[in-house]
Amino acid sequence: RKAVLDCEAMKTNEFPSPCLDSKTKVVMKGQNVSMFCSHKNKSLQITYSLFRRKTHLGTQDGKGEPAIFNLSITEAHESGPYKCKAQVTSCSKYSRDFSFTIVDPVTSPVLNIMVIQTETDRHITLHCLSVNGSLPINYTFFENHVAISPAISKYDREPAEFNLTKKNPGEEEEYRCEAKNRLPNYATYSHPVTMPSTGGDSCPFCLK
């Protein structure tokens, strides 16, 4: 009862709930993350504890600065939920739950090209597929290192497709595609596929 009264004596705005956050919310297995437990009250000596579901991960004391808990996300269950507790004497408050999203990185996609050759034009269909990685996957097609398509989102394990028509070119064109999912700063590219210039029988991807 005494503990409850002590805590009630502290006004809510004087000792609100702490905030639990991480700069990285989308992670892949094996990634190291830092979790920050902070409190608006900068004058109190606060004891911070971090929990995941119903296990205790650590305790730190702090005043004015957030407590930083460094973890490695190696198993699916380590996505969370996490919560932190801020405690001053007998008064404690809990943060809202925080969970990471674990995403498998995309593997290098495979680019396939199909061409229908006419006398004046080439009708090119590009297919791009990454066989591994958490969905959805965004695919972007490039010609000579310049994006020629918007990001095409695929929510199933099917290739992205992009069609273009070109006047029969006089020089080689190099195509590649990029695969990217929710993992920040993590994109993979296909091997480049070179389309030779016209002239003679030099269209290996053409449908005859």
């Epitope: 503990a3 119903k54 205790h56 991960l57």
Partner: antibody, heavy 119, light 112 residues
Framework: EVQLVESGGGLVQPGGSLRLSCAAS????????ITWVRQAPGKGLEWIGT???????YYSTWAKGRFTISRDNSKNTVYLQMNSLRAEDTAVYYC?????????????WGQGTLVTVSS | DIQMTQSPSSLSASVGDRVTITCQSS????????LSWYQQKPGKAPKLLIY???RLASGVPSRFSGSGSGTDFTLTISSLQPEDFATYYC????????????FGTGTKVTVL
Amino acid sequence: EVQLVESGGGLVQPGGSLRLSCAASGFSLTIYTITWVRQAPGKGLEWIGTINSYGNTYYSTWAKGRFTISRDNSKNTVYLQMNSLRAEDTAVYYCARGYVDSDWYLNIWGQGTLVTVSS
Amino acid sequence: DIQMTQSPSSLSASVGDRVTITCQSSESVYDNNYLSWYQQKPGKAPKLLIYDASRLASGVPSRFSGSGSGTDFTLTISSLQPEDFATYYCLGGYDSSGWYAAFGTGTKVTVL
């Protein structure tokens, strides 16, 4: 098969020490928590302490100082070091595994090992 | 120290009876539901019945149920079976003064 096997129990004199072992098989101690529980003859269950997947240890008030829990990941074994033993420490000692991320939902138990403290 | 008091400490009942055991804690358990129930038979290790105060552990018959929150919890056996005569314990998890666990005092269920 997932199982825990305790060993190291026996007769010890008051003031003596004993180290109990809890060998885990079928799972890794780097993911699961292990808890030691004891039961004196004809009495109830008593929580001694816990070592979680991160290696953090937690003890009941009465066990702190006299009892120490440790683990050897290479042997997949948890230990309970008991010092300054007294007659009232006579009990069956169990180790038990918790659910993932739930230290005290003890769903796998060893068979127990009897410790008798007597002169 | 945290006290976990079970009542009654013992009870006699017949097959088919509805049995209720209560567990009262001197402090709120962590998350208001960090409580489990165990069944123990003589010479055997305890067996997990209920976790999260009300969730049935794998392989446990549905005649067992749990309820409660904070400091007061109940284990109910809707229709007592011959194999249910045993001693029952609650176990609470706490974070008020460190990370801590405590068993209840136990309830022995015997044949009437």
